[in-house]
């Protein structure tokens, strides 16, 4: 098993919003979950857009999870992953 | 580390309001994080009744919708539960408690406060 | 809303024993799902989340597993300061909601 490393990172998206995008890369298996919670619950999935796993030429994958959300509302979401028994959350950068 | 104590009056008369405050030491309710009241009914059930968010938004239970409200005094760290047109039904101990964003689990719990609504 | 079974109700175990407690969600909760323990008189205690992650301070007899609708907290050896009641809630949606409790008493 290879955990995956996780990397989240924000873009300017239309006035007043942002994309927040949420990277695994270097995993092995290729079985993951990678989410957005919003308040501390699931945020609905038709809110969220998702890679599809792929892999990254080292014998491992990589995918993401992206989502938009109002400028100055970062801190009430962070990115969720489950990975071979394991899992972390991740925050929004400032 | 964070405490949080809760206090209010112990007995209500029925059509009235119930009020609770929830008071926290060592840790400002303004940085982050999620300030909520949980109840729990003779019996043990537990009961989520809503959170004022470190900025300020509510989400409440749909179950207590037009009779809740949770406000908060930053300038004291406290936060308060309003539950009007109480009736037997909301004798209860109520607890305020706190989560993070990482998932509503409760980490931190006050003592509870036990209400009695009884003419 | 998602409803939250729990059982048995209440059960009575010997020191040393091992325990299982279950709770069944109306939905998929994808393992959004806390366990806490509660003494008489006093406030729940935290004792997993994430379905499977000890809180901190939490001893290593206590354990969690599931998913989907299907989730368990296990004690093993027990001892007698576990005994009490045990809820889970699930955090996968609002409104937040608790199962009913499981009574652990010690034989």
């Known amino acids: 098993t290879v955990p995956p490393m996780v990397n989240v990172t924000r873009s300017e998206a239309s006035e007043g919003n942002i994309t927040v995008t949420c990277r695994a890369s270097s995993f092995y298996p290729r079985n993951i979950t990678l989410t957005w919670r919003q308040d501390g619950v699931s945020l609905s999935h038709d809110t969220q857009q998702w890679g599809d796993v792929l892999p990254d030429g080292n014998g491992t994958y990589q995918t993401w999870v992206a989502t938009r959300i109002c400028r100055g509302e970062e801190q009430r979401f962070t990115c969720y992953m489950e990975h071979s028994g394991n899992h972390s959350t991740h925050p929004v950068p400032s | 580390d964070v405490q949080l104590q809760g206090s209010g009056p112990g007995l209500v008369k029925p059509s009235q309001s119930l009020s609770l405050t929830c008071s926290v030491t060592g840790y400002s309710i303004t940085n982050d994080y999620y300030w909520n009241w949980i109840r729990q009914f003779p019996g043990n059930k537990l009961e989520w009744m809503?959170?004022?968010?470190?900025?300020?938004?509510?989400n409440y239970n749909p179950s207590l919708k037009n009779r809740i409200s949770i406000t908060r005094d930053t300038s004291k760290n406290q936060f308060f539960l309003k539950l009007s047109s109480v009736t037997t039904e909301d004798t209860a101990t109520y607890y305020c408690?706190?989560?993070d964003g990482r998932g509503a689990w409760f980490a931190y719990w006050a003592q509870g406060t036990l209400v009695t609504v009884s003419a | 809303d998602i409803q939250m079974t729990q059982s048995p109700a209440s059960l009575s175990a010997s020191v040393g024993e091992t325990v299982t407690i279950t709770c069944r969600a109306s939905g998929n909760i994808h393992n959004y799902l806390a366990w806490y323990q509660q003494k008489q008189g006093k406030s729940p205690q935290l004792l997993v989340y994430d379905a499977i992650t000890l809180a901190d301070g939490v001893p290593s007899r206590f354990s969690g597993s599931g998913s989907g609708t299907q989730y368990s907290l296990k004690i093993n050896s027990l001892q007698p300061e576990d005994f009490g009641n045990y809820y889970c809630q699930h955090f996968w949606s609002f409104p937040l909601t608790f199962g009913a409790g499981t009574k652990v008493e010690i034989k």
């Open positions: 809503g959170f004022i968010s470190f900025g300020g938004s509510n």
């Open positions: 408690a706190r989560y």
